[in-house]
C-alpha cells in the first residue's frame, strides 16, 4: 500500500521529533550465522571488551581492540611492515532520557570497533 | 538518581510495548571522523554496497562484500591459502510499522557486514 504523499521521510527536517517505537524486536533471522572465531584466526587478531551501560538499549556491547600494531605473518610472528587497524561502525542505540522512568528514549549514535583488518601502511616520503 | 520504584522494566510483561523515542540524535559528532580507505588497503579488501530502504531508519546502510575468497599478499597477488571473511555485526534499526505515516516504528535487528579480515582457514583432516 502506498505511503501518504504528505508523510515526510525519516531523514527530512519536517519529520516528527518524537516517534512511537515498539520494543518487540523484529528478528530477521539474524541468528542464522555461526558465531565466528575470526578474532583469534585473523592476521590482525583482536580481543573483545565488554561495555555495559544500563541506561542504554542494548545495555551490553562487545567492542574489539586490535591485539597488535602489526599483523601476524605465516610463521606466527608480528610483521610491523603491515598494520592491524580497527574496522569501526556507527550504530544506533537508545538512551534513556531519564533515570526516573524508562519509557522515554533518545536515539544516540555510537562508534564501535567490530573487528580488525590488516592494511598496508601509508608511506609518507620526506621531501 | 534512582529510577521510580513503580517503573516496570522493558523486558517485563507489564512494560509498555511502545516507548517514546526522540529522533534528535545524540552524538552527531560521531561523523566527524574521516572515512577510511581501509577497504582498499586491506589484505582482505572489500567493496561497499548501498542498501536503501525508505521504510527503515536509517534509510541507507552501506554493506561490505569481500572482493576475493583469498587474501592479497605482499606481491599484490591473491593467496588462496588464506581466506577473506566478512566481519558481521548485529545493529538496531527502526522499521516503520505502517506505510501510511511514519510516526510508528518497530525496533529491528539487522546483521550487516562492516568490513573483511584475513583468516587462516580451518583445515579439516580426513580420517
Amino acid at each position: 500500500m502506498p505511503r501518504n504523499p504528505g508523510c515526510p521521510n525519516a531523514e527530512d527536517k519536517n519529520f516528527p521529533q518524537n516517534v512511537k517505537v515498539s520494543l518487540n524486536i523484529l528478528n530477521k533471522s539474524v541468528n542464522s550465522r555461526r558465531p565466528s572465531d575470526y578474532y583469534n584466526r585473523s592476521t590482525s587478531p583482536w580481543t573483545l571488551h565488554r561495555n555495559e551501560d544500563r541506561e542504554r538499549y542494548p545495555s551490553v556491547i562487545w567492542e574489539a581492540k586490535c591485539r597488535h600494531l602489526g599483523c601476524v605473518n605465516a610463521e606466527g610472528n608480528v610483521d610491523h611492515h603491515m598494520n592491524s587497524v580497527p574496522i569501526q561502525q556507527e550504530i544506533l542505540v537508545l538512551r534513556r532520557e531519564s533515570q526516573h522512568c524508562p519509557h522515554s528514549f533518545r536515539l544516540e549514535k555510537m562508534l564501535v570497533a567490530v573487528g580488525c583488518t590488516c592494511v598496508t601502511p601509508i608511506i609518507h616520503h620526506m621531501a | 538518581m534512582p529510577r521510580n520504584p513503580g517503573c516496570p522494566n522493558a523486558e517485563d510483561k507489564n512494560f509498555p510495548q511502545n516507548v517514546k523515542v526522540s529522533l534528535n540524535i545524540l552524538n552527531k559528532s560521531v561523523n566527524s571522523r574521516r572515512p577510511s580507505d581501509y577497504y582498499n588497503r586491506s589484505t582482505s579488501p572489500w567493496t561497499l554496497h548501498r542498501n536503501e530502504d525508505r521504510e527503515r531508519y536509517p534509510s541507507v546502510i552501506w554493506e561490505a562484500k569481500c572482493r576475493h575468497l583469498g587474501c592479497v599478499n605482499a606481491e599484490g597477488n591473491v593467496d588462496h591459502h588464506m581466506n577473506s571473511v566478512p566481519i558481521q555485526q548485529e545493529i538496531l534499526v527502526l522499521r516503520r510499522e505502517s506505510q501510511h505515516c511514519p510516526h510508528s516504528f518497530r525496533l529491528e535487528k539487522m546483521l550487516v557486514a562492516v568490513g573483511c579480515t584475513c583468516v587462516t582457514p580451518i583445515i579439516h583432516h580426513m580420517a
Epitope: 544500563r54 538499549y57 545495555s59 551490553v60 524508562p102 | 529510577r3 521510580n4 522494566n9 522493558a10 523486558e11
Partner: antibody, heavy 121, light 107 residues
Framework: EVQLVQSGAEVKKPGSSVKVSCKAS????????IHWVRQAPGQGLEWMGV????????FYNQKFDGRVTLTADESTSTAYMELSSLRSEDTAVYYC??????????????WGQGTTVTVSS | DIQMTQSPSSLSASVGDRVTITCRAS??????IDWFQQKPGKAPKRLIY???DLASGVPSRFSGSGSGTDYTLTISSLQPEDFATYYC?????????FGQGTKLEIK
Amino acid sequence: EVQLVQSGAEVKKPGSSVKVSCKASGYTFTDYEIHWVRQAPGQGLEWMGVNDPESGGTFYNQKFDGRVTLTADESTSTAYMELSSLRSEDTAVYYCTRYSKWDSFDGMDYWGQGTTVTVSS
Amino acid sequence: DIQMTQSPSSLSASVGDRVTITCRASSGIISYIDWFQQKPGKAPKRLIYATFDLASGVPSRFSGSGSGTDYTLTISSLQPEDFATYYCRQVGSYPETFGQGTKLEIK
C-alpha cells in the same frame, strides 16, 4: 519456557580440570550472555566470569588467575565453563545464569540447577 | 574489588513481621543493587533489580531502596515461604560482587 540445564556432578583430583556444560532452551541464545557463579559449601556467591555466545567475547574475575575458560556453542545453544589446576577450595556448586544484552536490568533472571564439583585426592 | 557487607548475617523473625536487610558497599561507585533469594539446595532467584524494581512474579511485600553505598531490602509482612538466605549484588564495578548473605530463620 526458559531453561538452563547443567551437566551432572563431578569428582576430580587436585591439579586436574573440569568442564561443566549449560544447555539453554526457550529463548534466543545469542540475545543473552551466560555468566557463571559459584558457591562453596556454606559460603556466599562468587561471580566467575561472562561469555557472549554471539561474539565469543569473555570477561573473567581476575581472582581465578587464568584458570577459567568460558566458551559457547551456538549450534547446540550450550555454554561451557572449564576450570583447570583444581584445588580443594574449588569444591563448590557452579551455576550458569543468563544475562540480557538488550536490557541488563533483566540480568540473571534464570539460573541453571547447579553442578556440584568435588575436588578430593 | 568492591566489598558488599550485609547485615545482619542472620536474623530470626516470625510470620507477619516486617524485616529489613541492609547491604553496604565499600565504595560508592556502584550503579545499582540486585537482590536474590536462595533456598537450601536451590539456585538463587532474583527478587529486586536496579535497586527498586520487583522481578516478574515476585510478591509486592518485597521492596528495595537505597543509593550511594547503603541499600535495603524490606519484606513488609513475612510469609512462611520467605525463610531463606538473601544476597545483594552490586552492579557497575567489576568484578560484580555479592554480599555474604543474610540467613532469615523462623523464630
